[in-house]
Interface confidence: medium
């Protein structure tokens, strides 16, 4: 669809005569008839297949024709067509004399014709005017013409229809060749698809308008590229929704069980070495001069009873000093001036001569020690009880009184509440600080997995539209991860329009 435009510029009829040679009275009141038709090698009479148009009287004899397009007038003349422009045409322009006001053909005398021109040729669609001039023996006509496409039609033949729009059917303008050019933020064949926020995750995010990024269930963040971990996950992360993968040093279903008490709490004091010995339990190995569960107590150097043979120990700033009893000498009173003849062995100890009687050695009965059997054995001095156990001397032996949660000769064993397999139906047992917890398999619940419940929440395929189903372990419910274009707890809602029509 387009328009053939003809702009009449100047008509010269100096003598004011008709085609017959007869003069007009008082002058030639001139109007034009135009016929546009298909290409003919020889332009001949017949239907004006592309259209006709007539002008009012434009002037007398010789005159210039005013461009009247800006004022809504009839120059240039418009010959619209509703077909593909063929690229060729025939054009007939007749100049007529109007003796009166009635310009209809039947109202004019047959010899009122002033001049007639006929041209034919090729003409491409375009904005440029072609200027032409036709001269006969008595007249001259100067004019120009062109073919342009109607609004919303494009292409070499005005055959491509394209209407710019910005609504639900598309968001685009038209290029000169009629192809669509999407408005910013839109894409697709008809520019109906919004371009989401740059970087918005292809699977986990979607949008209903440009520069938007809406997250599907289980995902979060500006670009929907961060998974949401299991509800209650404390010290863990996820790589897919509802996971809880524990950070180093943490365990349990919710990663809330401390497996690295030493690092997280640094309980050992005074430079002691800390060793993890189970969940929330540890052992401190003290540096010399310190004692206590956390090596928090400073030992006197005399506490280790360094003076032998009944010597008494005195603390000093730079160490200690032994005061030896008669008959002994040395740093620790370890050297004797006595022999077995002096009965040096106490508490029933047996004396044995050494070095030809120059020295002796005492063999002590049970529960006594020291070079003269002068010390009662204290089996707790080596602090043998682990995990804060209390050491008790019991006659010839010792025993450890353990803190709650520990057992064994030296309190070295963590009491496992799981040892008796309390979780029914294949449940997994987790030791907690004060008790235990069962993780039940699908279909069971209760504190000990003793209650048979429904089968796996996803087994009934509750999610619509090919959504992925996840079972939420903490609530025994399902979560649907929707594909592009769907929302809702079961992905049952297409991302469409509300019932009002905002577009």
């Amino acid at each position: 669809s387009g328009v053939f435009q003809l702009q009449l510029q100047e008509f010269i009829n100096e003598r004011g005569v008709l085609a017959s040679g007869r003069p007009c009275e008082p002058g030639c009141r001139t109007f034009f008839r135009v016929c546009l038709k298909h290409f003919q090698a020889v332009v001949s009479p017949g239907p004006c297949t592309f259209g006709t148009v007539s002008t009012p009287v434009l002037g007398t004899n010789s005159f210039a024709v005013r461009d009247d397009s800006s004022g809504g007038g009839r120059n240039p003349l418009q010959l619209p067509f509703n077909f593909t422009w063929p690229g060729t045409f025939s054009l007939i322009i007749e100049a007529w004399h109007a003796p009166g006001d009635d310009l209809r053909p039947e109202a004019l005398p047959p010899d009122a014709l002033i001049s007639k021109i006929a041209i034919q040729g090729s003409l491409a669609v375009g904005q440029n005017w072609l200027l032409d001039e036709q001269t006969s023996t008595l007249t001259r006509l100067r004019y120009s013409y062109r073919v342009i496409c109607s609004d919303n039609y494009y292409g070499d033949n005005c055959s491509r229809l394209c209407k710019k729009r910005n609504d639900h059917f598309g968001h685009y303008v038209c290029q000169p060749d009629g192809n669509l050019s999407c408005l910013p933020g839109w894409t697709g064949e008809y520019c109906q698809q919004p371009i989401c926020l740059s970087g918005c995750h292809e699977q986990n995010g979607y949008c209903s308008k440009p520069a938007e990024c809406l997250c599907r269930p289980g995902w979060q963040g500006r670009l929907c590229n961060e998974c949401i971990p299991h509800n209650g996950c404390r010290h863990g992360t996820c790589s897919t929704p509802w996971q809880c993968t524990c950070d180093e040093g943490w365990g349990g279903l919710f990663c809330d069980q401390d497996l690295n008490y030493c690092t997280h709490h640094s309980p050992c004091k005074n430079g002691a070495t800390c060793s993890n010995s189970g969940q929330r339990s540890y052992t401190c190995t003290c540096r010399p001069g310190y004692t206590g569960v956390d090596c928090e107590l400073e030992l006197s150097e005399c506490d280790s009873n360094p003076c032998r043979n009944g010597g008494s120990c005195k603390d000093q700033e730079d160490g200690y000093h032994c005061l030896c009893p008669p008959g002994y000498y040395g740093l620790h009173c370890e050297h004797s001036t006595l022999s077995c003849a002096d009965s040096p062995c106490f508490n029933g100890g047996s004396c044995r001569e050494r070095n030809q009687g120059a020295n002796y050695a005492c063999e002590c009965p049970p529960n006594f020690t020291g070079s003269n059997c002068e010390k009662k054995v204290d089996r707790c001095t080596s602090n043998p009880c682990a995990n804060g156990g209390q050491c008790l001397n019991r006659g010839p032996s010792r025993m450890c009184r353990c803190r709650p949660g520990f057992t064994g000769t030296y309190c070295e064993l963590h009491v496992s509440d799981c040892a008796r397999n309390p979780c029914a139906h294949g449940g997994t047992c987790h030791d907690l600080e004060n008790g235990l917890m069962c993780t039940c398999p699908a279909g069971f619940s209760g504190r000990r997995c003793e209650v048979r419940t429904s089968i796996d929440a996803c087994a009934s395929s509750p999610c619509f539209n090919r959504a992925t189903c996840y079972t939420d372990l903490s609530t025994d419910t399902f979560v649907c991860n929707c594909p592009y274009g769907f929302v809702g707890s079961r992905c049952e809602f297409p991302v469409g329009l509300p019932p009002s029509f905002p577009w």
């Epitope: 209407k163 729009r165 609504d167 639900h168 059917f169 598309g170 008809y190 029509f501 577009w503």
Partner: nanobody, 123 residues
Framework: EVQLVESGGGLVQAGGSLRLSCAAS????????MGWYRQAPGKQRELVAA???????YYADCVKGRFTISRDYAKNTVYLQMNSLKPEDTAVYYC?????????????????WGQGTQVTVSS
């Protein structure tokens, strides 16, 4: 006032096809966009497909590639060809004239809804 009469619904097995028709009487709607809507029990009415006066089409993502909207200007009728039907397509289907920024706004007498036609897809 324009009367919109929907027909062509019924019971069909999943994977089957139906063709809905919407005939308008009392006015011509050649200048207006026309759309097919559906409403499942307990859900909001949603636009499924639309066709503008220059035959541009719009489809909701959930029906793209399965449903085709068309119109017959001579008969004042809009059609919805539904292929590869799924149980989730079960709903009452209505036709009406949505407003578009490009098409002239539908006259006020398009405001009333027809009775609709029930489409049930069994699995």
């Amino acid at each position: 006032e324009v009367q919109l009469v929907e027909s062509g619904g019924g019971l069909v097995q999943a994977g089957g096809s139906l063709r809905l028709s919407c005939a308008a009487s009392g006015s011509t709607f050649t200048s207006y966009a026309m759309g097919w809507y559906r409403q499942a029990p307990g859900k909001q009415r949603e636009l499924v497909a639309a066709i503008s006066s220059d035959d541009s089409t719009y489809y909701a993502d959930c029906v793209k590639g399965r449903f085709t909207i068309s119109r017959d200007y001579a008969k004042n009728t809009v059609y919805l060809q539904m292929n590869s039907l799924k149980p989730e397509d079960t709903a009452v289907y209505y036709c009406n004239a949505p407003h578009s920024d490009y098409d002239e706004e539908a006259p006020s007498d398009f405001g009333s809804w027809g009775q609709g036609t029930q489409v049930t897809v069994s699995s």
